[in-house]
Structure formats: C-alpha cells, structure tokens
Amino acid sequence: AILGRSETQECLFFNANWEKDRTNQTGVEPCYGDKDKRRHCFATWKNISGSIEIVKQGCWLDDINCYDRTDCVEKKDSPEVYFCCCEGNMCNEKFSYFPEMEVTQPTSNPVTPKPV
C-alpha cells in the first residue's frame, strides 16, 4: 500500500568538490532510474563551528528510508556529516536539522542553503 506518493523527477544539484569531480557546481539534476524504482532528493552538509558547509545535493536512488518524507530533515543527534533525503521535485532545496533524542524534546534548526 502506498499513500500520497510524491514523484521525484528533478532535484537541486550542488557539489562542493565540483572541480575535482569534473561536474557542475550547482544546477538542477534530472533524476533517472528504472521505472519500477522510486527516486529521491538528498542533501549532505557539515556544521563547522556553527557555519553550514554544503557537501552535496542531488538525486538519490530508491531507498525505503526516504519514503513518505516530503521535507529534507536530518534527525540524528550530532552526526559528523548531516544527511537528509525526501520525495518530491526539488524537495532538497531547503533542508533542516531537527535532532530527536529519545528523552529530550527536539528543537528545530531550519537551514536554507546558499551555495557560494
């Protein structure tokens, strides 16, 4: 059963390592894949002394942990590299860190990426 499924056809693309990887730095990435597979968008970033540094954004292959996620939200507490994925066109344009620990109440820290 699939409820309210959101098709992903394109995602915001960013690659901080674009020169070494020989890719564009930023743009819109069309998401390709087998027709029976779902597609997602993702974002990865680091928090260096309170400053957000985006590592990569783009399309993400079919991954059940990305199903039913309309917003790109990292919920893990204090990861080394932040990661989120979502379903829906350009859903990785905005991403946020919303740590959820089992005991304490979560607090939201929305991040709007501004690739330099």
Partner: antibody, heavy 118, light 111 residues
Framework: EVQLLESGGGLVQPGGSLRLSCAAS????????MSWVRQAPGKGLEWVSG????????YYTDSVKGRFTVSRDNSRNTLYLQMNSLRAEDTAVYYC???????????WGQGTLVTVSS | QTVVTQEPSFSVSPGGTVTLTCGFN?????????PSWYQQTPGQAPRTLIY???TRSSGVPDRFSGSILGNKAALTITGAQADDESDYYC??????????FGGGTKLTVLG
C-alpha cells in the same frame, strides 16, 4: 545500545492467527524503516515484510500477501506483524530488523519462533 | 519472480582467500541494488558485514570486503580464520520496498 526484542511467537494450528511484536530501544524508532525477515528450520533467510518511517507504505513477499499485515506504533516504539490464515510453511524464526539508509538491515533482533502445526 | 543466486557451499584453507558471489536472474547486479552481506552462525541472529556494495559495518574486520565483480556482487574474505566458518547471505534491494535474499553460502574453513 540498539535493541530489538521480538515476542508473540508460539504454536498455532493451520488457519490460525498470531501477532508478533518487536520492541525497539536505543534509537529513535520513528526515524527508520523496519522489516521482518524469517528463517524456516534448516533453511535460509527470507524477507517477509517492510514498512516505511510513517507506516504509510507497506510491502510484502508474494507468499504472505493478503494474509500478513505489518504495522508500527511510533509512540510505543513497536513494530507488529499480524499473521492470519497461517500455513505449515510459515513455520520459522521471525526476526525484526532496523533498516538504515541505503536500504540495508543494520540491526537484528534475536528472533521469535512461530510453529504452525496441528 | 526474482531469484538471487549464491554458491551453496565453499571451502577455504586457514589463511586463504575466498570470494563468494551473488547474482540474479533478471540481469546484472549493480550498486543501485545496494548489495549487502550478512554472516550467520547456527542458532544466532544474522550479523551485518557489508552494506551499500563495499562499506564495512561497524566492528567488521578489514579481512572482509565487498565489490561488484562482472555482473555480480561479491564478498571476499582474505586471511580466512576458523571462526569465519558460517553461513553468508547476500541481499539485494529491488526497489519499491522489496528485498530479495540469496539462498546463502555455507563456508567451511578446512583443517
């Protein structure tokens, strides 16, 4: 420490029902997809069912479709498998498994034995 | 119906190297199937060894490595030890919420 504790297994007659539970702790349950995997005596592992983070998407192997229902209660940190119209070939140890990004099973429970026999 | 195939059994000498493979009947295995490998000893729950083709799970020794060899996923054990004697399962994520396990390989460490 991540822990997954299955319960609810036992002996049941063919055509009967059982409800398995998997109590999760040590991680934020509502952030991860979950799955059930079974192993018949002396046989290999077989994927049975999976469920997305919200419970909005559920999936089954062909042999249990229409008989088994997977669900989750994120407020109770518990995964369920409702098994109806049980058959002898459903006899197995049932494991619950946490699913991590890249869709792999990163933690497993110790399993609960379901025996379907008259 | 997708069938994932593994060698039913394999043997290796202590200190030797063995490569177990995982293929399927519908084409080539690629990284998009997120191949993962699990070790199981009798009476125990499976243990995660390799995920996402070639990433070792936490605490897994670097004797275990994963790769794509030709059109199959592969698990290589170098410097095999007696306690590597186990059943090994590969799993492919077919997408859209569906996983398929291989039939498993029973590894015997000789001697």
């Amino acid at each position: 420490e991540v822990q997954l504790l299955e319960s609810g297994g036992g002996l049941v007659q063919p055509g009967g029902s059982l409800r398995l539970s998997c109590a999760a702790s040590g991680f934020t349950f509502r952030n991860y997809a979950m799955s059930w995997v079974r192993q018949a005596p002396g046989k290999g592992l077989e994927w049975v069912s999976g469920i997305s983070v919200t419970g909005g998407s559920t999936y089954y192997t062909d042999s249990v479709k229409g008989r088994f229902t997977v669900s989750r209660d994120n407020s109770r940190n518990t995964l369920y498998l409702q098994m109806n119209s049980l058959r002898a070939e459903d006899t197995a140890v049932y494991y619950c498994a946490k699913v991590y990004y890249s869709s792999f099973f990163d933690y497993w429970g110790q399993g609960t034995l379901v025996t379907v026999s008259s | 119906q997708t069938v994932v195939t593994q060698e039913p059994s394999f043997s290796v000498s202590p200190g030797g190297t063995v490569t177990l493979t995982c293929g399927f009947n519908s084409g080539s295995v690629s990284t998009s199937y997120y191949p993962s490998w699990y070790q199981q000893t009798p009476g125990q729950a499976p243990r995660t060894l390799i995920y996402n083709t070639n990433t070792r799970s936490s605490g897994v020794p670097d004797r275990f490595s994963g790769s794509i060899l030709g059109n199959k996923a592969a698990l290589t054990i170098t410097g095999a030890q007696a306690d590597d004697e186990s059943d090994y399962y590969c799993v492919l994520y077919m997408g859209s919420g569906i996983w398929v396990f291989g039939g498993g390989t029973k590894l015997t460490v000789l001697g």
